[in-house]
Interface confidence: low
Protein backbone atom coordinates (compact mmCIF):
# COMPACT_ATOMS: atom_id res chain seq x y z
CA UNK A 1 0.00 0.00 0.00
CA UNK A 2 1.20 3.54 -0.84
CA UNK A 3 2.61 5.61 1.97
CA UNK A 4 0.15 8.02 3.56
CA UNK A 5 0.07 11.50 2.10
CA UNK A 6 -1.35 14.55 3.83
CA UNK A 7 -3.11 16.70 1.25
CA UNK A 8 -3.93 20.33 1.85
CA UNK A 9 -5.61 21.26 -1.43
CA UNK A 10 -5.79 24.99 -0.77
CA UNK A 11 -2.52 26.85 -1.06
CA UNK A 12 -4.18 29.92 0.38
CA UNK A 13 -7.46 30.91 1.99
CA UNK A 14 -8.69 34.46 2.28
CA UNK A 15 -11.18 35.34 5.03
CA UNK A 16 -12.70 38.59 6.22
CA UNK A 17 -12.27 39.45 9.88
CA UNK A 18 -15.16 38.11 11.95
CA UNK A 19 -15.89 35.28 9.55
CA UNK A 20 -15.12 31.56 9.78
CA UNK A 21 -12.13 30.03 8.00
CA UNK A 22 -12.25 26.48 6.73
CA UNK A 23 -8.88 24.75 6.35
CA UNK A 24 -9.07 21.57 4.31
CA UNK A 25 -6.97 18.50 4.89
CA UNK A 26 -7.30 14.86 3.83
CA UNK A 27 -5.11 11.82 4.28
CA UNK A 28 -4.73 9.15 1.62
CA UNK A 29 -4.59 6.24 4.06
CA UNK A 30 -5.69 5.16 7.51
CA UNK A 31 -2.27 3.71 8.22
CA UNK A 32 -0.33 4.40 10.34
CA UNK A 33 -2.73 4.87 13.21
CA UNK A 34 -2.38 8.16 15.04
CA UNK A 35 -4.02 11.52 15.51
CA UNK A 36 -4.00 14.61 13.32
CA UNK A 37 -2.85 17.93 14.73
CA UNK A 38 -3.09 21.38 13.21
CA UNK A 39 -0.34 23.96 13.74
CA UNK A 40 0.15 27.53 12.78
CA UNK A 41 3.70 28.06 11.63
CA UNK A 42 6.55 25.60 11.50
CA UNK A 43 9.52 24.73 13.64
CA UNK A 44 9.87 24.63 17.42
CA UNK A 45 7.83 27.81 17.96
CA UNK A 46 4.80 26.56 16.05
CA UNK A 47 1.42 27.08 17.71
CA UNK A 48 -0.99 24.22 18.30
CA UNK A 49 -4.40 25.01 16.85
CA UNK A 50 -6.18 21.67 17.14
CA UNK A 51 -5.28 18.25 18.41
CA UNK A 52 -7.51 15.31 17.52
CA UNK A 53 -6.26 13.47 20.53
CA UNK A 54 -6.52 15.94 23.40
CA UNK A 55 -7.03 19.57 24.39
CA UNK A 56 -9.78 22.17 24.32
CA UNK A 57 -10.12 24.39 21.25
CA UNK A 58 -13.31 26.42 21.60
CA UNK A 59 -12.99 28.24 18.26
CA UNK A 60 -12.25 25.09 16.24
CA UNK A 61 -14.77 22.62 14.90
CA UNK A 62 -14.07 19.60 12.73
CA UNK A 63 -15.84 19.49 9.38
CA UNK A 64 -16.23 15.69 9.47
CA UNK A 65 -16.88 13.29 12.31
CA UNK A 66 -13.30 12.89 13.48
CA UNK A 67 -13.98 10.09 15.95
CA UNK A 68 -14.79 7.57 13.19
CA UNK A 69 -11.79 5.36 12.45
CA UNK A 70 -12.47 5.36 8.71
CA UNK A 71 -12.48 9.17 8.58
CA UNK A 72 -9.73 10.62 6.38
CA UNK A 73 -11.05 14.19 6.28
CA UNK A 74 -9.30 16.30 8.88
CA UNK A 75 -10.58 19.69 7.75
CA UNK A 76 -11.29 22.23 10.45
CA UNK A 77 -13.20 25.50 10.76
CA UNK A 78 -11.95 28.36 12.90
CA UNK A 79 -14.59 30.88 13.95
CA UNK A 80 -14.43 34.62 14.51
CA UNK A 81 -11.24 35.15 12.56
CA UNK A 82 -9.11 38.18 13.44
CA UNK A 83 -5.94 39.55 11.79
CA UNK A 84 -3.96 37.82 14.55
CA UNK A 85 -4.99 34.46 13.03
CA UNK A 86 -3.09 35.09 9.79
CA UNK A 87 -0.32 32.65 9.01
CA UNK A 88 0.45 29.28 7.46
CA UNK A 89 -1.51 26.36 8.87
CA UNK A 90 -0.12 22.83 8.65
CA UNK A 91 -2.12 19.66 8.93
CA UNK A 92 0.21 17.11 10.54
CA UNK A 93 -0.26 13.34 10.84
CA UNK A 94 1.18 11.78 13.99
CA UNK A 95 2.15 8.13 14.47
CA UNK A 96 0.85 6.36 17.52
CA UNK A 97 3.49 6.08 20.19
CA UNK A 98 4.62 7.13 23.62
CA UNK A 99 4.65 9.96 22.95
CA UNK A 100 3.05 10.25 19.51
CA UNK A 101 5.64 11.19 16.91
CA UNK A 102 5.24 13.38 13.86
CA UNK A 103 4.89 11.35 10.71
CA UNK A 104 3.96 13.61 7.80
CA UNK A 105 2.89 17.19 7.26
CA UNK A 106 0.76 18.77 4.58
CA UNK A 107 2.21 21.49 2.40
CA UNK A 108 0.45 24.18 4.39
CA UNK A 109 -2.40 26.59 3.80
CA UNK A 110 -1.73 30.29 4.04
CA UNK A 111 -4.57 32.01 5.86
CA UNK A 112 -4.82 35.67 4.95
CA UNK A 113 -7.20 37.78 6.95
CA UNK A 114 -8.89 40.72 5.37
CA UNK A 115 -9.57 43.34 8.02
CA UNK A 116 -11.17 46.66 7.20
CA UNK A 117 -9.28 49.86 7.85
CA UNK A 118 -10.68 52.15 10.51
CA UNK A 119 -12.40 55.34 9.38
CA UNK A 120 -9.69 57.76 8.27
CA UNK A 121 -9.10 60.59 10.73
CA UNK A 122 -7.95 63.83 9.15
CA UNK A 123 -6.33 66.50 11.27
CA UNK A 124 -5.08 69.91 10.28
CA UNK A 125 -2.61 72.42 11.69
CA UNK A 126 -2.97 73.66 15.27
CA UNK A 127 -2.93 77.32 14.24
CA UNK A 128 -4.83 79.12 11.52
CA UNK A 129 -3.01 80.24 8.38
CA UNK A 130 -3.70 82.90 5.80
CA UNK A 131 -4.21 82.51 2.04
CA UNK A 132 -1.13 81.73 -0.07
CA UNK A 133 0.34 79.76 2.82
CA UNK A 134 0.90 76.00 2.64
CA UNK A 135 -0.54 73.93 5.45
CA UNK A 136 -0.19 70.25 6.25
CA UNK A 137 -2.99 67.77 6.89
CA UNK A 138 -2.52 64.28 8.24
CA UNK A 139 -4.68 61.24 7.68
CA UNK A 140 -4.52 58.04 9.71
CA UNK A 141 -6.27 54.71 9.39
CA UNK A 142 -5.53 51.55 11.35
CA UNK A 143 -6.13 47.85 11.73
CA UNK A 144 -6.32 46.74 8.12
CA UNK A 145 -5.05 43.61 6.43
CA UNK A 146 -3.70 42.72 3.92
CA UNK A 147 -1.08 45.45 3.78
CA UNK A 148 -1.90 46.71 0.31
CA UNK A 149 -3.95 49.88 0.49
CA UNK A 150 -4.47 52.99 -1.61
CA UNK A 151 -4.79 56.46 -0.13
CA UNK A 152 -5.79 59.55 -2.06
CA UNK A 153 -6.21 63.19 -1.07
CA UNK A 154 -8.78 65.57 -2.49
CA UNK A 155 -9.57 69.23 -2.07
CA UNK A 156 -13.13 69.99 -3.15
CA UNK A 157 -13.14 66.94 -5.41
CA UNK A 158 -9.79 67.72 -7.02
CA UNK A 159 -7.12 65.11 -6.38
CA UNK A 160 -3.99 66.37 -4.62
CA UNK A 161 -0.53 65.18 -5.56
CA UNK A 162 1.71 66.70 -2.90
CA UNK A 163 1.57 64.09 -0.15
CA UNK A 164 3.66 61.40 1.49
CA UNK A 165 2.27 58.12 2.73
CA UNK A 166 3.68 55.40 4.97
CA UNK A 167 2.26 52.00 5.77
CA UNK A 168 3.49 50.51 9.03
CA UNK A 169 4.99 48.24 10.02
CA UNK A 170 7.33 47.66 7.10
CA UNK A 171 7.64 43.96 7.92
CA UNK A 172 5.03 41.26 8.22
CA UNK A 173 2.26 41.97 10.71
CA UNK A 174 -1.24 40.81 11.55
CA UNK A 175 -2.58 44.27 10.74
CA UNK A 176 -1.28 47.56 9.42
CA UNK A 177 -1.67 51.30 9.78
CA UNK A 178 -1.40 54.03 7.18
CA UNK A 179 -0.26 57.59 7.82
CA UNK A 180 -0.26 60.27 5.17
CA UNK A 181 0.63 63.95 5.17
CA UNK A 182 -0.65 66.26 2.45
CA UNK A 183 0.33 69.82 1.73
CA UNK A 184 -2.44 72.25 0.79
CA UNK A 185 -2.05 75.82 -0.45
CA UNK A 186 -4.79 78.03 0.96
CA UNK A 187 -6.72 80.55 -1.15
CA UNK A 188 -9.08 83.33 -0.09
CA UNK A 189 -12.00 81.24 -1.34
CA UNK A 190 -11.28 78.26 0.93
CA UNK A 191 -13.64 79.01 3.81
CA UNK A 192 -16.15 76.51 2.39
CA UNK A 193 -13.47 74.09 1.15
CA UNK A 194 -12.96 70.56 2.40
CA UNK A 195 -9.90 68.34 2.41
CA UNK A 196 -10.76 64.69 2.00
CA UNK A 197 -8.61 61.63 2.65
CA UNK A 198 -9.88 58.57 0.82
CA UNK A 199 -8.74 55.06 1.65
CA UNK A 200 -9.40 52.13 -0.68
CA UNK A 201 -8.83 48.57 0.47
CA UNK A 202 -9.81 45.13 -0.77
CA UNK A 203 -12.16 44.70 2.20
CA UNK A 204 -14.19 47.75 1.26
CA UNK A 205 -15.52 46.23 -1.97
CA UNK A 206 -14.97 49.34 -4.03
CA UNK A 207 -16.59 51.68 -1.50
CA UNK A 208 -13.68 53.66 -0.05
CA UNK A 209 -13.66 55.21 3.40
CA UNK A 210 -13.33 58.96 3.66
CA UNK A 211 -12.19 61.34 6.33
CA UNK A 212 -12.71 65.07 5.99
CA UNK A 213 -11.43 68.32 7.39
CA UNK A 214 -13.09 71.68 6.87
CA UNK A 215 -10.68 74.41 5.87
CA UNK A 216 -12.91 76.81 7.80
CA UNK A 217 -11.12 75.48 10.89
CA UNK A 218 -7.72 76.19 9.35
CA UNK A 219 -7.98 79.37 7.34
CA UNK A 220 -7.85 82.98 8.44
CA UNK A 221 -8.81 85.55 5.80
CA UNK A 222 -7.65 89.00 6.95
CA UNK A 223 -10.05 91.88 6.34
CA UNK A 224 -9.71 94.77 3.94
CA UNK A 225 -10.65 98.17 5.28
CA UNK A 226 -12.16 101.19 3.56
CA UNK A 227 -12.93 104.44 5.34
CA UNK A 228 -15.25 106.92 3.63
CA UNK A 229 -17.20 109.99 4.62
CA UNK A 230 -20.63 111.15 3.55
CA UNK A 231 -22.14 114.51 4.33
CA UNK A 232 -25.36 114.49 6.35
CA UNK A 233 -28.23 117.03 6.35
CA UNK A 234 -26.92 118.90 9.32
CA UNK A 235 -24.02 120.99 8.01
CA UNK A 236 -21.96 120.59 11.15
CA UNK A 237 -22.06 116.78 11.06
CA UNK A 238 -20.09 114.27 8.96
CA UNK A 239 -20.83 110.57 8.74
CA UNK A 240 -17.67 108.45 8.49
CA UNK A 241 -17.96 104.73 7.74
CA UNK A 242 -15.43 101.95 8.05
CA UNK A 243 -16.22 99.03 5.79
CA UNK A 244 -14.55 95.81 6.92
CA UNK A 245 -14.68 93.33 4.08
CA UNK A 246 -13.95 89.68 3.34
CA UNK A 247 -12.76 88.43 6.71
CA UNK A 248 -12.90 85.03 8.37
CA UNK A 249 -13.45 83.92 11.11
CA UNK A 250 -15.98 86.36 12.52
CA UNK A 251 -14.03 87.27 15.66
CA UNK A 252 -13.22 90.94 15.12
CA UNK A 253 -12.92 94.08 17.24
CA UNK A 254 -13.02 97.59 15.78
CA UNK A 255 -11.76 100.74 17.46
CA UNK A 256 -12.33 104.31 16.27
CA UNK A 257 -9.59 106.79 17.08
CA UNK A 258 -9.85 110.57 16.75
CA UNK A 259 -6.42 112.13 16.44
CA UNK A 260 -4.97 108.99 18.00
CA UNK A 261 -7.34 108.91 20.95
CA UNK A 262 -9.73 106.02 21.37
CA UNK A 263 -13.24 107.19 20.65
CA UNK A 264 -15.15 103.92 20.70
CA UNK A 265 -14.53 100.16 20.59
CA UNK A 266 -17.04 97.63 19.31
CA UNK A 267 -17.16 93.94 18.49
CA UNK A 268 -18.54 92.61 15.20
CA UNK A 269 -21.89 91.03 15.92
CA UNK A 270 -24.46 91.08 13.15
CA UNK A 271 -22.37 90.56 10.05
CA UNK A 272 -23.15 89.84 6.42
CA UNK A 273 -21.92 86.53 5.04
CA UNK A 274 -20.54 86.47 1.52
CA UNK A 275 -21.05 83.57 -0.87
CA UNK A 276 -17.46 82.43 -0.28
CA UNK A 277 -18.06 82.19 3.47
CA UNK A 278 -16.20 85.37 4.42
CA UNK A 279 -17.92 88.18 6.31
CA UNK A 280 -18.48 91.91 5.82
CA UNK A 281 -19.19 94.45 8.52
CA UNK A 282 -19.62 98.20 8.65
CA UNK A 283 -19.21 100.69 11.47
CA UNK A 284 -20.47 104.28 11.34
CA UNK A 285 -19.14 107.28 13.20
CA UNK A 286 -21.10 110.56 13.27
CA UNK A 287 -18.66 113.42 13.84
CA UNK A 288 -19.70 116.87 14.99
CA UNK A 289 -17.39 119.08 12.92
CA UNK A 290 -18.21 122.27 14.81
CA UNK A 291 -16.68 120.78 17.92
CA UNK A 292 -13.26 120.76 16.24
CA UNK A 293 -11.14 123.76 15.42
CA UNK A 294 -8.42 121.80 13.59
CA UNK A 295 -8.50 118.99 11.06
CA UNK A 296 -9.41 115.59 12.54
CA UNK A 297 -7.57 112.36 11.74
CA UNK A 298 -10.07 109.52 12.06
CA UNK A 299 -8.62 106.02 12.26
CA UNK A 300 -10.51 102.76 11.94
CA UNK A 301 -8.42 100.11 13.72
CA UNK A 302 -9.35 96.46 13.43
CA UNK A 303 -8.04 93.54 15.44
CA UNK A 304 -9.04 90.31 13.68
CA UNK A 305 -8.89 86.90 15.31
CA UNK A 306 -6.23 87.96 17.81
CA UNK A 307 -3.83 89.13 15.12
CA UNK A 308 -1.94 92.45 15.16
CA UNK A 309 -4.27 95.34 14.41
CA UNK A 310 -4.63 96.80 10.93
CA UNK A 311 -5.93 100.29 10.43
CA UNK A 312 -6.99 102.82 7.88
CA UNK A 313 -7.18 106.57 8.45
CA UNK A 314 -9.20 109.41 7.02
CA UNK A 315 -8.36 113.08 7.31
CA UNK A 316 -11.42 115.16 8.05
CA UNK A 317 -11.02 118.83 7.05
CA UNK A 318 -12.96 121.15 9.29
CA UNK A 319 -11.80 124.46 7.75
CA UNK A 320 -13.24 123.76 4.32
CA UNK A 321 -15.86 121.53 2.72
CA UNK A 322 -15.14 117.97 3.75
CA UNK A 323 -13.38 115.86 1.13
CA UNK A 324 -12.50 112.17 1.06
CA UNK A 325 -8.85 111.52 1.64
CA UNK A 326 -7.70 108.07 2.84
CA UNK A 327 -4.32 106.80 3.90
CA UNK A 328 -3.27 103.25 4.79
CA UNK A 329 -1.34 102.48 7.92
CA UNK A 330 -1.18 98.73 7.34
CA UNK A 331 -0.68 96.53 4.30
CA UNK A 332 -3.93 95.06 3.06
CA UNK A 333 -5.61 93.24 0.21
CA UNK A 334 -8.43 94.91 -1.66
CA UNK A 335 -11.76 93.18 -1.21
CA UNK A 336 -14.59 93.22 -3.74
CA UNK A 337 -17.75 95.17 -3.04
CA UNK A 338 -20.51 93.20 -1.39
CA UNK A 339 -23.87 93.99 0.17
CA UNK A 340 -23.41 95.38 3.70
CA UNK A 341 -25.49 95.37 6.82
CA UNK A 342 -25.32 98.88 8.27
CA UNK A 343 -24.85 99.45 11.95
CA UNK A 344 -25.67 103.04 12.94
CA UNK A 345 -23.39 104.08 15.75
CA UNK A 346 -24.00 107.78 16.42
CA UNK A 347 -21.17 109.54 18.15
CA UNK A 348 -21.56 113.23 18.93
CA UNK A 349 -18.88 115.73 19.84
Amino acid sequence: EEELQVIQPDKSVLVAAGETATLRCTATSLIPVGPIQWFRGAGPARELIYNQKEGHFPRVTTVSESTKRENMDFSISISNITPADAGTYYCVKFRKGSPDTEFKSGAGTELSVRAKPSAPVVSGPAARATPQHTVSFTCESHGFSPRDITLKWFKNGNELSDFQTNVDPVGESVSYSIHSTAKVVLTREDVHSQVICEVAHVTLQGDPLRGTANLSETIRVPPTLEVTQQPVRAENQVNVTCQVRKFYPQRLQLTWLENGNVSRTETASTVTENKDGTYNWMSWLLVNVSAHRDDVKLTCQVEHDGQPAVSKSHDLKVSAHPKEQGSNTAAENTGSNERHHHHHHHHHH
Partner: antibody, heavy 119, light 107 residues
Protein backbone atom coordinates in the same frame (compact mmCIF):
# COMPACT_ATOMS: atom_id res chain seq x y z
CA UNK B 1 -7.02 41.42 -22.51
CA UNK B 2 -4.21 41.98 -20.02
CA UNK B 3 -1.29 43.66 -21.73
CA UNK B 4 2.01 45.30 -20.84
CA UNK B 5 3.41 47.61 -23.51
CA UNK B 6 7.01 48.71 -23.08
CA UNK B 7 8.84 51.67 -24.53
CA UNK B 8 11.16 51.32 -27.50
CA UNK B 9 14.79 50.33 -27.74
CA UNK B 10 17.43 52.68 -26.35
CA UNK B 11 21.10 53.28 -27.13
CA UNK B 12 23.02 54.96 -24.33
CA UNK B 13 26.58 55.96 -23.58
CA UNK B 14 28.40 54.66 -20.49
CA UNK B 15 27.61 56.75 -17.41
CA UNK B 16 24.24 57.82 -18.76
CA UNK B 17 20.80 56.83 -17.46
CA UNK B 18 17.91 55.08 -19.15
CA UNK B 19 14.24 55.13 -18.21
CA UNK B 20 12.01 52.36 -19.51
CA UNK B 21 8.23 52.60 -19.29
CA UNK B 22 5.64 49.85 -19.06
CA UNK B 23 2.01 50.72 -19.80
CA UNK B 24 -0.49 48.30 -18.27
CA UNK B 25 -4.01 47.69 -19.53
CA UNK B 26 -6.79 45.16 -19.17
CA UNK B 27 -6.66 44.85 -15.38
CA UNK B 28 -6.77 46.96 -12.24
CA UNK B 29 -3.27 48.35 -12.15
CA UNK B 30 -3.21 48.97 -8.40
CA UNK B 31 -4.13 45.36 -7.62
CA UNK B 32 -0.76 43.90 -8.58
CA UNK B 33 2.95 44.33 -8.31
CA UNK B 34 5.16 45.16 -11.26
CA UNK B 35 8.48 43.34 -11.45
CA UNK B 36 11.47 44.33 -13.56
CA UNK B 37 13.65 41.54 -14.89
CA UNK B 38 16.58 41.81 -17.25
CA UNK B 39 18.31 39.38 -19.54
CA UNK B 40 21.82 39.95 -20.78
CA UNK B 41 22.24 38.52 -24.31
CA UNK B 42 22.83 34.76 -24.15
CA UNK B 43 22.31 34.66 -20.39
CA UNK B 44 19.54 33.93 -17.92
CA UNK B 45 16.92 36.04 -16.20
CA UNK B 46 17.85 38.44 -13.43
CA UNK B 47 15.34 40.07 -11.07
CA UNK B 48 15.93 43.78 -10.47
CA UNK B 49 13.08 44.77 -8.23
CA UNK B 50 9.36 45.36 -7.91
CA UNK B 51 6.88 48.04 -7.08
CA UNK B 52 3.51 47.34 -5.51
CA UNK B 53 1.34 49.54 -7.67
CA UNK B 54 -1.30 50.01 -4.98
CA UNK B 55 0.88 51.59 -2.30
CA UNK B 56 4.18 52.19 -4.13
CA UNK B 57 6.09 49.87 -1.83
CA UNK B 58 9.37 49.12 -3.57
CA UNK B 59 11.95 46.40 -3.16
CA UNK B 60 15.21 46.34 -5.09
CA UNK B 61 17.74 43.61 -5.61
CA UNK B 62 20.86 44.45 -3.62
CA UNK B 63 22.86 44.15 -6.83
CA UNK B 64 21.10 47.17 -8.32
CA UNK B 65 20.48 49.15 -5.12
CA UNK B 66 21.52 52.75 -5.63
CA UNK B 67 21.46 52.53 -9.42
CA UNK B 68 17.87 51.52 -10.08
CA UNK B 69 14.72 53.53 -9.40
CA UNK B 70 11.30 52.01 -9.92
CA UNK B 71 8.28 54.27 -9.93
CA UNK B 72 4.68 54.18 -11.03
CA UNK B 73 1.96 56.55 -12.17
CA UNK B 74 -1.41 55.11 -11.22
CA UNK B 75 -3.37 57.62 -13.31
CA UNK B 76 -1.40 56.57 -16.38
CA UNK B 77 -1.34 52.88 -15.28
CA UNK B 78 2.36 52.92 -16.10
CA UNK B 79 5.42 51.65 -14.28
CA UNK B 80 8.92 52.98 -14.87
CA UNK B 81 12.40 51.62 -14.33
CA UNK B 82 15.36 53.97 -14.42
CA UNK B 83 18.89 52.61 -14.37
CA UNK B 84 21.72 55.07 -13.87
CA UNK B 85 25.51 54.99 -14.23
CA UNK B 86 25.17 52.64 -17.18
CA UNK B 87 28.03 50.35 -18.10
CA UNK B 88 28.51 48.10 -21.10
CA UNK B 89 27.48 45.07 -19.05
CA UNK B 90 24.04 46.65 -18.61
CA UNK B 91 23.36 45.94 -22.26
CA UNK B 92 20.32 43.69 -21.98
CA UNK B 93 16.65 43.22 -22.66
CA UNK B 94 14.64 44.72 -19.80
CA UNK B 95 11.23 43.21 -19.08
CA UNK B 96 8.37 44.38 -16.93
CA UNK B 97 6.12 41.63 -15.58
CA UNK B 98 2.93 41.66 -13.56
CA UNK B 99 3.09 39.83 -10.25
CA UNK B 100 0.64 38.81 -7.57
CA UNK B 101 0.95 40.00 -3.99
CA UNK B 102 1.42 36.61 -2.42
CA UNK B 103 3.33 34.09 -4.50
CA UNK B 104 5.10 36.74 -6.53
CA UNK B 105 4.90 34.78 -9.71
CA UNK B 106 5.01 36.77 -12.95
CA UNK B 107 2.02 35.86 -15.05
CA UNK B 108 2.04 38.60 -17.71
CA UNK B 109 5.19 39.97 -19.34
CA UNK B 110 5.98 42.90 -21.58
CA UNK B 111 7.76 42.19 -24.87
CA UNK B 112 10.97 43.66 -23.50
CA UNK B 113 13.02 46.79 -24.16
CA UNK B 114 16.49 46.43 -25.57
CA UNK B 115 18.99 48.78 -23.97
CA UNK B 116 22.40 49.00 -25.60
CA UNK B 117 25.23 50.71 -23.73
CA UNK B 118 28.07 51.62 -26.01
CA UNK B 119 30.59 54.40 -26.31
CA UNK C 1 19.98 35.17 -0.48
CA UNK C 2 18.42 31.99 -1.80
CA UNK C 3 20.22 30.34 -4.69
CA UNK C 4 18.32 28.21 -7.17
CA UNK C 5 20.22 25.52 -9.05
CA UNK C 6 18.66 24.06 -12.16
CA UNK C 7 19.67 20.88 -13.89
CA UNK C 8 20.46 19.88 -16.49
CA UNK C 9 21.57 23.07 -18.23
CA UNK C 10 20.55 21.50 -21.54
CA UNK C 11 19.05 18.31 -22.81
CA UNK C 12 18.18 16.73 -26.15
CA UNK C 13 14.88 14.96 -26.55
CA UNK C 14 12.48 13.78 -29.22
CA UNK C 15 8.84 14.57 -29.80
CA UNK C 16 6.77 12.31 -27.56
CA UNK C 17 9.45 11.96 -24.90
CA UNK C 18 8.82 12.59 -21.20
CA UNK C 19 11.19 15.26 -19.94
CA UNK C 20 11.94 16.20 -16.33
CA UNK C 21 13.83 19.27 -15.23
CA UNK C 22 14.83 19.70 -11.61
CA UNK C 23 15.37 22.73 -9.47
CA UNK C 24 17.00 22.84 -6.05
CA UNK C 25 16.82 25.75 -3.60
CA UNK C 26 19.63 26.50 -1.18
CA UNK C 27 17.10 26.51 1.67
CA UNK C 28 13.51 25.43 2.19
CA UNK C 29 11.11 27.60 0.23
CA UNK C 30 7.88 25.75 0.98
CA UNK C 31 6.02 25.75 -2.35
CA UNK C 32 7.06 29.22 -3.44
CA UNK C 33 8.49 28.07 -6.76
CA UNK C 34 7.41 28.99 -10.28
CA UNK C 35 8.31 27.67 -13.73
CA UNK C 36 8.64 29.66 -16.96
CA UNK C 37 9.17 28.85 -20.63
CA UNK C 38 11.07 31.19 -22.93
CA UNK C 39 11.50 31.00 -26.67
CA UNK C 40 14.22 32.91 -28.55
CA UNK C 41 13.46 36.61 -28.90
CA UNK C 42 10.34 36.32 -26.78
CA UNK C 43 9.41 37.15 -23.21
CA UNK C 44 9.13 34.33 -20.66
CA UNK C 45 5.76 32.67 -20.14
CA UNK C 46 4.47 31.40 -16.78
CA UNK C 47 3.73 27.66 -16.78
CA UNK C 48 3.46 26.62 -13.13
CA UNK C 49 3.10 28.65 -9.96
CA UNK C 50 3.26 27.55 -6.34
CA UNK C 51 5.30 24.50 -7.31
CA UNK C 52 2.41 22.58 -8.82
CA UNK C 53 -0.42 24.88 -9.87
CA UNK C 54 -0.86 24.88 -13.62
CA UNK C 55 -1.34 28.37 -15.01
CA UNK C 56 -4.55 28.93 -16.95
CA UNK C 57 -4.17 28.12 -20.63
CA UNK C 58 -1.08 25.95 -20.18
CA UNK C 59 -1.40 22.41 -21.60
CA UNK C 60 -1.87 19.65 -19.03
CA UNK C 61 1.21 17.81 -20.28
CA UNK C 62 3.15 20.25 -18.09
CA UNK C 63 3.21 19.44 -14.41
CA UNK C 64 5.18 20.64 -11.43
CA UNK C 65 5.99 18.99 -8.16
CA UNK C 66 8.12 19.36 -5.08
CA UNK C 67 8.23 21.30 -1.85
CA UNK C 68 10.92 22.57 0.44
CA UNK C 69 14.15 22.51 -1.53
CA UNK C 70 13.61 20.07 -4.40
CA UNK C 71 11.28 20.70 -7.30
CA UNK C 72 10.71 19.33 -10.74
CA UNK C 73 8.97 20.24 -13.96
CA UNK C 74 7.76 17.37 -16.09
CA UNK C 75 6.66 17.54 -19.70
CA UNK C 76 4.73 14.44 -20.66
CA UNK C 77 4.83 13.68 -24.40
CA UNK C 78 7.05 16.51 -25.61
CA UNK C 79 5.55 18.51 -28.50
CA UNK C 80 7.41 20.47 -31.22
CA UNK C 81 6.38 23.79 -29.67
CA UNK C 82 7.90 22.75 -26.34
CA UNK C 83 11.47 23.14 -27.54
CA UNK C 84 12.57 26.19 -25.55
CA UNK C 85 14.48 27.26 -22.45
CA UNK C 86 12.85 26.64 -19.06
CA UNK C 87 13.52 28.63 -15.90
CA UNK C 88 12.51 28.03 -12.30
CA UNK C 89 12.11 30.97 -9.94
CA UNK C 90 11.87 31.07 -6.16
CA UNK C 91 9.40 33.56 -4.71
CA UNK C 92 9.89 32.74 -1.06
CA UNK C 93 12.01 35.76 -0.25
CA UNK C 94 13.66 38.71 -1.91
CA UNK C 95 15.76 39.03 -3.90
CA UNK C 96 13.70 36.77 -6.12
CA UNK C 97 16.02 34.51 -8.05
CA UNK C 98 15.92 32.38 -11.16
CA UNK C 99 17.62 29.13 -12.00
CA UNK C 100 20.22 29.24 -14.75
CA UNK C 101 17.82 27.73 -17.26
CA UNK C 102 17.46 24.41 -19.06
CA UNK C 103 17.54 24.44 -22.84
CA UNK C 104 15.43 21.65 -24.33
CA UNK C 105 16.67 20.92 -27.85
CA UNK C 106 15.56 18.56 -30.60
CA UNK C 107 17.52 15.35 -30.66
Amino acid sequence: QVQLVQSGAEVKKPGASVKVSCKASGYTFTSNAMHWVRQVPGQGLEWMGWIKAGNAEIKYSQKFQGRVTITRDTSATTAYMELSSLRSEDTAVYYCARGDYYYYYMDVWGKGTTVTVSS
Amino acid sequence: DIQVTQSPSSLSASVGDRVTITCRASQSISDFLNWYQQKPGKAPKLLIHAASSLQAGVPSRFSGSGSGTDFSLTINSLQPEDFATYYCQQSYSTPLSFGGGTKVEIK
